[in-house]
């Protein structure tokens, strides 16, 4: 029965970008400017998102898809579909309730967003610190102290720094 009814429903013929206009004998009318319908058979068009203030337009609203927003320079997107814009900080900083603060000693942030993370503990992998960490960079771990003893072969190159994880958006 449902399938039969949908086949007879004139609104089911209205494609995306239109709405089924009850005021015009269920004719398919184009979505007016600043509105869209992303699926067929809709009885109304949705209002387009406006990218205002700290948001800027990434992609205009078309008749079939909503506008896509981005953040103005100095801010970055957070949340699904860039629902929020968060202030950028410098590398070596993290955003707190009181604004951008330098990373504490022993932590680093190599991005303009996210939190400060602890330096890699080289000794956990049985290695030594080859290059000291900074607020902006993780430490670089090198060969273990035993590998550096006299007579030991030093053909093996130092292991690369562990890839820092990306903070969630």
């Amino acid at each position: 029965f449902e399938r039969t009814r949908s086949l007879q429903d004139p609104c089911s013929n209205c494609p995306a970008g239109t709405f089924c206009d009850n005021n015009r004998n269920q004719i398919c009318s184009p979505c007016p400017p600043n509105s869209f319908s992303s699926a067929g058979g809709q009885r109304t068009c949705d209002i387009c998102r406006q990218c205002k203030g700290v948001f800027r337009t990434r992609k205009e609203c078309s008749s079939t898809s909503n506008a896509e927003c981005d953040c103005t320079p100095g801010f970055h997107c957070l949340g699904a579909g860039c629902s929020m814009c968060e202030q950028d900080c410098k590398q070596g900083q993290e955003l707190t309730k009181k604004g951008c603060k330098d990373c504490c000693f022993g932590t680093f942030n190599d991005q303009k967003r996210g939190i400060c993370r602890p330096w890699t503990n080289c000794s956990l992998d049985g290695k030594s610190v080859l290059v000291n960490g900074t607020k902006e960079r993780d430490v670089v771990c090198g060969p273990s102290p035993a590998d550096l003893s006299p007579g030991a072969s030093s053909v093996t190159p130092p292991a690369p720094a562990r890839e820092p994880g990306h903070s969630p958006q």
Partner: antibody, heavy 113, light 112 residues
């Protein structure tokens, strides 16, 4: 809206066209470039939107670059050929879209050896 | 690419008559279609966008309709000033920063 910079150039010569506007703020609108070869139809090149993002027709991507200041929009063209001979129009988009509604008179670019 | 096929290429009608121009898209574009009028030596003029929305200052004698792949521009009560070439144009986004904002081939309207 007024275009400038069109002239006679030889193939391969780079050229930059400038669109100067008054009476409205460029960064509140989509600003569009369209061209028309002599006696031919209209061809959409691309636009820079109100957010500063650029979009190009597939044939124009890589060879044309659109940029803007607060009062001008530039169209940088490279590797020009005889087929690029056309009147180049700059236009403002209507109602937050990339449909051109306010057009300049156009500037003629002739590519010939 | 989205191809816009515009018909007829040319049409001639008397003053007071009506003209219908059709535009067919190679794939569904919702209602993202505009119509322009261009006279020799002039830039185009936007008549209709979003398939049926009349642009500012345009006479209500111009009517746009259609959705999906089939669109129509109707000019009623023709005037001598309507003699021009008319173009349809779609708005369609491809991947990345590529667009298919394609124009139709144009229709020359002659008013007798």
């Amino acid at each position: 809206v007024e275009e400038s910079g069109g002239r006679l150039v030889t193939p391969g010569t780079p050229l930059t066209l400038t669109c100067t506007v008054s009476g409205f703020t460029i960064n509140s609108y989509h600003m569009i470039w369209v061209r028309q070869a002599p006696g031919e139809g209209l061809e959409y090149i691309g636009f820079i939107n109100d957010g500063g993002f650029t979009y190009y027709a597939s044939w124009a991507k890589g060879r044309f670059i659109i940029s803007r200041t607060s009062t001008t929009v530039d169209l940088k063209m490279t590797s020009l050929t005889v087929a690029d001979t056309a009147t180049y129009f700059c236009a403002r988009g209507v109602d937050g879209t990339s449909y051109p509604d306010l057009w300049g008179p156009g500037t003629l670019v002739t590519v010939s050896s | 690419d989205v191809v816009m096929t515009q018909t007829p290429a040319s049409v001639s009608e008397p003053v007071g008559g009506a003209v219908t121009i059709k535009c067919q898209a190679s794939q569904s574009i919702g209602s993202d279609l505009a119509w322009y009028q261009q006279k020799p030596g002039q830039p185009p003029k936007l008549l209709i966008y979003r398939a049926s929305t009349l642009a500012s200052g345009v006479s209500s004698r111009f009517k746009g309709s259609g959705s999906g792949t089939e669109f129509t521009l109707t000019i009623s009560d023709l005037e001598c000033a309507d003699a021009a070439t008319y173009y349809c144009q779609c708005i369609y986004y491809g991947s990345d920063d590529v667009i298919y904002h394609t124009f139709g081939g144009g229709t020359e309207v002659v008013v007798k």
